[in-house]
């Protein structure tokens, strides 16, 4: 079994993450893929979903999440823009095949935002300044409520989806982007949990 | 254990033909793309082409010094790759390995131990 | 189609000392911060042994003084301490774009 880990990454408000999600197999290219938040004592939370089918470079915004998923690359973008002290909390990206569990991709991300904008990298290594945009011609997908043994998806928190953004292009200058590579679990575990699995609609790392 | 097992290479004149076969076991095989790799005796290393899998409508690509007289094919239910290779040039005598990558554009983490073709008249 | 480029062709290095492999590619081989890019060791008679992948993770199984770095177009990868066994022929290799690369390949022998 994979031993699920967790990586903090601490950030102030204004910040942007921006996280790259692994999935590499082609099978997985086009399956609705989820980002989520686990929040003490409850059962992970759809944040926001890609289309589904997923659609290649094709933005999909929730609120202040923008989701863009390479197939090319086997790459999902997630971005969480202007991020606000309620965002803190543990995330992860899935792969969501309802009514199927989603298969999380990667390490846990153990987010801290904390007051305070500063304009200046922070201490991580990884920090850049950015200008995020997002095109107009953004889409936002529905994600299919489901509940399985351990996953109840529900409508995401005040937190983090009823923060709104123009439908035009987003500019955010002196942002702190904080990129990260997210480890894919072994390929044999997500490749055996898998095999036996018909695709219901349409991938794994070393 | 993975295994990648190559067969098929001999002599053949130029202009003839020759199919190369890519047997695999230890792994899902329908899940990877599939590539073929070649080597000049005492040459580097030379990309030949991959197959991707169903999901990506078994999509082919070509290094362009074999584009047009080479074809990549896969047969799933057989656990076998293969490579065709046309109108064949003194220039195209190798060792050509059948290679795994670790999922989309990712690195070859395994290959096979070759085999010879050799074009002459 | 993207040129790698790797130097020097041939290199001659005492045995427990640093040896270093470069790699130019003629244009970007990254997508986002990803590195496409990959390290290979191949010995005589045999098929290419992959050590370093996306530009800096080490193949498991693989000894650590064997390390990669670089991004964008310039890589490197660096062997700690030279030891017998690593005499062999290292390559690059770049999968951001069709059609893949290889570079000509770096001769590595003991002095």
């Known amino acids: 079994a994979t031993k699920l880990t967790e990586e903090k990454y601490e950030l102030k408000e204004g910040q942007t993450l921006d996280v790259k999600c692994d999935y590499t197999l082609e099978k997985f290219a086009s399956s609705q893929k989820a980002w989520q938040i686990i929040r003490d004592g409850e059962m992970p939370k759809t944040l926001a979903c890609t289309e589904r089918p997923s659609k290649n470079s094709h933005p999909v915004q929730v609120g202040r999440i923008i989701l863009e998923d390479y197939h090319d690359h086997g790459l999902l973008r997630v971005a969480m823009v202007n991020l606000q002290v309620e965002d803190s909390g543990l995330y992860q990206c899935v792969i969501y095949q309802p009514p199927k569990e989603p298969h999380m991709l990667f390490d846990r991300i153990r987010l801290v935002v904390t007051k305070g904008f500063s304009g200046t990298p922070g201490s991580n290594e990884n920090s850049t300044q950015n200008v995020y945009k997002i095109p107009p011609t953004t889409t936002k997908a529905l994600c299919p409520l489901y509940t399985s043994p351990r996953t109840v998806t529900q409508a995401p928190p005040k937190s983090t989806a009823d923060v709104s953004t123009p439908d035009s292009e987003i500019n955010l200058t002196n942002v702190t982007d904080i990129i990260r590579e997210q480890k894919l679990i072994s390929e044999e575990d997500l490749e055996q949990k898998l095999i036996s699995e018909e695709d219901l609609h349409h991938h794994h790392h070393h | 254990e993975v295994q990648l097992v190559e067969s098929g290479g001999g002599l053949v004149q130029p202009g003839g033909s020759l199919k190369l076969s890519c047997a695999a076991s230890?792994?899902?095989?329908?899940?990877?793309?599939m590539h073929w790799v070649r080597q000049a005796s005492g040459k580097g290393l030379e990309w030949v082409g991959r197959i991707r899998t169903k999901s990506s409508n078994y999509a082919t690509y070509y290094a362009a010094s074999v584009k047009g007289r080479f074809t990549i094919s896969r047969d799933d239910s057989k656990n076998t790759a293969y490579l065709q290779m046309n109108s064949l040039k003194t220039e195209d005598t190798a060792v050509y390995y059948c290679t795994r990558d670790m999922g989309i554009r990712r690195q070859f983490a395994y290959w096979g131990q070759g085999t010879l073709v050799t074009v002459s008249s | 189609d993207i040129v790698l480029t790797q130097s020097p062709d041939s290199l001659a290095v005492s045995l427990g000392e640093r040896a270093t492999i470069n790699c130019r590619a003629s244009?970007?081989?990254?997508?986002?911060?990803?590195?496409?890019l990959h390290w290979y060791q191949q010995k005589p008679g045999q098929p290419p042994k992959l050590l370093i992948y996306?530009?800096?993770n080490l193949e498991s199984g693989v000894p650590d003084r064997f390390s990669g770095s670089g991004s964008g177009t310039d890589f490197t990868l660096t062997i700690s301490s030279l030891q017998a066994e690593d005499v062999a022929v290292y390559y690059c290799?770049?999968?951001?774009?069709?059609?893949?690369?290889f570079g000509q390949g770096t001769k590595l022998e003991i002095k």
């Open positions: 996306r530009a800096s």
């Open positions: 290799q770049q999968s951001n774009e069709d059609p893949y690369t």
């Open positions: 244009e970007s081989v990254d997508t986002f911060d990803y590195s496409f």
């Open positions: 230890g792994f899902t095989f329908s899940t990877y793309a």
